[in-house]
């Protein structure tokens, strides 16, 4: 049977969730007045770029929208973007779509997402509310790169 993406709400240790603002993803406090995105996650079938030490290769999309997370270089810096793309279109491609790929690694009960196109660059939220989700190579105090994937019905 055809594979289906897994659905999660995504949250960090400061109880910030991911929210769609226009065509951007921002971090906002978990709140009744804010509708967090449901993240779609599906494994890549092609093993060309696989590296088990870094985690499983996955595509990340926004449920209910034809939007997927995508890494591209802007002014020489790896940048996280949303691109109009159906996650299942990426999945059915025989060849791995590298800019859309992330290494999904588990660290304790949290998940970490590293760009396949830009090794050492991780999906992150800043400590300030309302800021875009971004890529960073600085893991630590000022950036949060560990996320909780909460099951949603």
């Amino acid at each position: 049977r055809e594979a289906a993406p897994k659905s999660y709400a995504i949250r960090d240790s400061r109880q910030m969730v991911w929210v769609l603002s226009g065509n951007s993803l921002i971090a906002a406090p978990l709140s009744r007045s804010i509708k967090p995105v449901t993240l779609h996650l599906i494994a890549c079938r092609d093993t060309e770029f696989s590296d088990k030490e870094k985690g499983n290769m996955v595509y990340l999309g926004i449920k209910g929208k034809d939007l997927c997370l995508f890494c591209a270089e802007i002014q020489g810096k790896p940048t996280l973007q949303l691109k109009e793309k159906n996650i299942m279109d990426l999945y059915v491609e025989k060849k791995a779509q590298k800019p859309f790929l992330f290494f999904h690694n588990k660290e304790g009960s949290t998940s970490v997402f590293q760009s396949v196109s830009y090794p050492g660059w991780f999906i992150a939220t800043s400590t300030t509310s309302g800021q875009p989700i971004f890529l960073t190579k600085e893991r630590g105090i000022t950036n949060n790169t560990n996320f909780y994937l909460d099951s949603v019905e």
């Epitope: 709400a9 949250r11 240790s13 400061r14 109880q15 910030m16 906002a28 406090p29 978990l30 709140s31 009744r32 007045s33 804010i34 967090p36 304790g108 009960s109 949290t110 400590t127 509310s129 909780y148 909460d150 099951s151 949603v152």
Partner: antibody, heavy 122, light 111 residues
Framework: ELQLQESGPGLVKPSETLSLTCTVS??????????WGWIRQPPGKGLEWIGS???????YYNPSLKSRVTISVDTSKNQFSLKLSSVTAADTAVYYC??????????????WGQGTLVTVSS | ESVLTQPPSVSGAPGQRVTISCTGS?????????VHWYQQLPGTAPKLLIY???NRPSGVPDRFSGSKSGTSASLAITGLQAEDEADYYC???????????FGGGTKLTVL
Amino acid sequence: ELQLQESGPGLVKPSETLSLTCTVSGGSITSSNYYWGWIRQPPGKGLEWIGSIDYTGSTYYNPSLKSRVTISVDTSKNQFSLKLSSVTAADTAVYYCATGKYYETYLGFDVWGQGTLVTVSS
Amino acid sequence: ESVLTQPPSVSGAPGQRVTISCTGSSSNIGAHYDVHWYQQLPGTAPKLLIYGNDNRPSGVPDRFSGSKSGTSASLAITGLQAEDEADYYCQSYDYSLSGYVFGGGTKLTVL
């Protein structure tokens, strides 16, 4: 319906460790998106959050108590517990366990135990 | 000293309207975390009265309402009744502490 019940000694000696357990009934402690907390209330005073543990096993502690607090879960008994070390008379309080659900109560606590009074005295 | 500030006491006659304020900062209420209100009747455990700033759990009378603006929140009680005499606490989340915070509590006296 989810219910919580605190248990543990009502009297603890100074410098010893206070140990309390909260038994969860009417639901599983491992159910997705739940968080479980300990809150205390010294006699005649207000509520103070001690710490929490959630369904992932992640713990969060009040910075003012962090060095003395441990919260853990026993999934086989459907319980979570509090340990507070090196207690003094200032730790005398009614201790409550409480729970909420991330995407339903939004970091509030909608179910509480009835509370248990712990006195620190020699 | 509590992270969230409430008046120690308020009072009102039966049938009147009273409000209880809760003032936080840019790392809790002002950061858009929700405010929750609890009622604690004498000798009992706190009970959730308002969650998510302005929502009543089932069974809570519509005489109780909550609101939030900026770094502050308020609980309003209309048509005050003798059984409303209790302590009221506000609560939120503070990202700088990575934890839950309470107000110091407000004692409501029905005259």
